[in-house]
């Protein structure tokens, strides 16, 4: 049967993002409509037809445009994505003979990790803190020269949609750690980044 091919996209916050739909059909559509999926009912964003060209709904006027003006292949572009733009979007191809044929493309917004790594000596122990804030939530691991060192992790969700993961490494015999390298590893969207810290006696 006639179908629409789409691809989900993941883009960085405050950058442009594009979603594309392709009608797998010998014939072009009569009109293409893009809608945002909502809990109750979908919200019309923009239409394109030969008769009327591009018609953008007021709520999306300065946010999007159709950047591929096709009736078989259609692309919408968000100029500057925010967290509110995350979600799934429907492209509806109203075709002659086969009615409305739809596809769904989902947009995920990510924020690159911001990482801080620092240490603090107490009288008889050393705390090394690694904190990573990102979207989606990052994971924090430690690479230390020897095993058996305890750590504790706290996760905090922020109103802006990011998540902070803070891990504290508790070292009971800090003297053995002086001059040695500790590595905090942050895993985000399949990529591991190392952050290195050499402990110096303050």
């Amino acid at each position: 049967q006639v179908q629409v091919v789409t691809q989900d996209e993941r883009e960085q916050l405050y950058t442009p993002a594009s979603l594309k739909c392709s009608l797998q059909n010998a014939q072009e559509a009569l009109i293409v409509t893009w809608q945002k999926k909502k809990a109750v009912s979908p919200e019309n964003m923009v239409t394109f037809s030969e008769n009327h060209g591009v018609v953008i709904q007021p709520a999306y006027k300065d946010k999007i445009n159709i950047t591929q003006l096709g009736l078989q292949n259609s692309t919408i572009t968000f100029w500057n994505i925010t967290l509110e733009d995350e979600g799934c979007y429907m492209c509806l191809f109203n075709t002659f003979g086969f009615g409305k044929i739809s596809g769904t493309a989902c947009l995920t917004v990510y924020v690159q990790p911001i990482v801080s790594l620092h240490y603090k000596f107490s009288e008889d122990h050393l705390n090394i803190t690694c904190s990573a804030t990102a979207r989606p939530a990052p994971m924090v691991f430690w690479k230390v020269p020897r095993s058996g060192i305890e750590n504790s992790t706290v996760t905090l969700s922020h109103p802006n949609g990011t998540t902070s993961v803070t891990s504290i490494l508790h070292i009971k015999d800090p003297k053995n750690q002086v001059g040695k390298e500790v590595i905090c590893q942050v895993l985000h969207l399949g990529t591991v980044t190392d952050f290195k810290q050499t402990v110096n006696k303050g």
């Epitope: 049967q1 006639v2 797998q24 059909n25 010998a26 014939q27 072009e28 559509a29 009569l30 008769n51 075709t95 002659f96 003979g97 086969f98 009615g99």
Partner: antibody, heavy 117, light 107 residues
Framework: QVQLVQSGAEVKKPGASVKVSCKAS????????ILWVRQAPGQRLEWMGH????????NYNLKFKGRVTITVDTSASTAYMELSSLRSEDTAVYYC??????????WGQGTLVTVSS | DIQMTQSPSSLSASVGDRVTITCKAS??????LSWFQQKPGKAPKSLIY???RLVDGVPSRFSGSGSGTDFTLTISSLQPEDFAIYYC?????????FGQGTKLEIK
């Protein structure tokens, strides 16, 4: 030049089936929808259904309750319309036509199907 | 199904006359309407698609207008070859449906 040539007239008994062919030439067969329309004596035109030869996707008028089947043989650039469980009211001229989206430009010459006991 | 009603059912006119045929849909069909001409014993011939677009090769004396539920076909100056039956077709919603036809006869 573009041509749609339909098969010849048929006389069928009630309850039988008829298969009408529509041979296309002069263009790329898979680029156009083939549609079928019929006209009973003195009646308005009636849309039966259509097929997109590119994918073989078809759509039918539910009035025919599954009695109509539209198929294509792309290697022969031919479309077929089969109507089963024939009754007297199916006596009509059956036309095929091609369309690019909603642009109809060429029609077959028509095939008279007579259903009579 | 969407009902298409044409008026008048028949019409007598003379060569050179301006003629208007109307087609009314039972619900909004946007601009998804075509007009056809049919002569006795012949296949229909497409004249207008998408309410107001002229099919290639059709004389410019034919024009279409309307959107929503009310549509018209106008022949600005009747020629002898224009005497025929005219049908409208809606293709906004399946099943696609034709009007009952308007027979245009010589007065």
């Amino acid at each position: 030049q573009v041509q749609l040539v339909q098969s010849g007239a048929e006389v069928k008994k009630p309850g039988a089936s008829v298969k009408v062919s529509c041979k296309a030439s002069g263009y790329s067969f898979t680029d156009y929808i083939i549609l079928w329309v019929r006209q009973a004596p003195g009646q308005r035109l009636e849309w039966m259904g259509h097929i997109d030869p590119y994918y073989g996707s078809s759509n039918y008028n539910l009035k025919f309750k599954g009695r109509v089947t539209i198929t294509v043989d792309t290697s022969a650039s031919t479309a077929y319309m089969e109507l089963s469980s024939l009754r007297s009211e199916d006596t009509a001229v059956y036309y095929c036509a091609r369309s690019k989206r909603d642009y109809f430009d060429y029609w077959g010459q028509g095939t008279l199907v007579t259903v009579s006991s | 199904d969407i009902q298409m009603t044409q008026s008048p059912s028949s019409l007598s006119a003379s060569v050179g006359d301006r003629v208007t045929i109307t087609c009314k849909a039972s619900q909004d069909i946007n601009s998804y309407l075509s007009w056809f001409q049919q002569k006795p014993g012949k296949a229909p011939k497409s004249l207008i698609y998408r309410a107001n677009r002229l099919v290639d090769g059709v004389p410019s004396r034919f024009s279409g207008s309307g959107s929503g539920t009310d549509f018209t076909l106008t022949i600005s100056s009747l020629q002898p070859e224009d005497f025929a039956i005219y049908y409208c077709l809606q293709y906004d919603e399946f099943p696609y449906t034709f009007g009952q036809g308007t027979k245009l006869e010589i007065k």
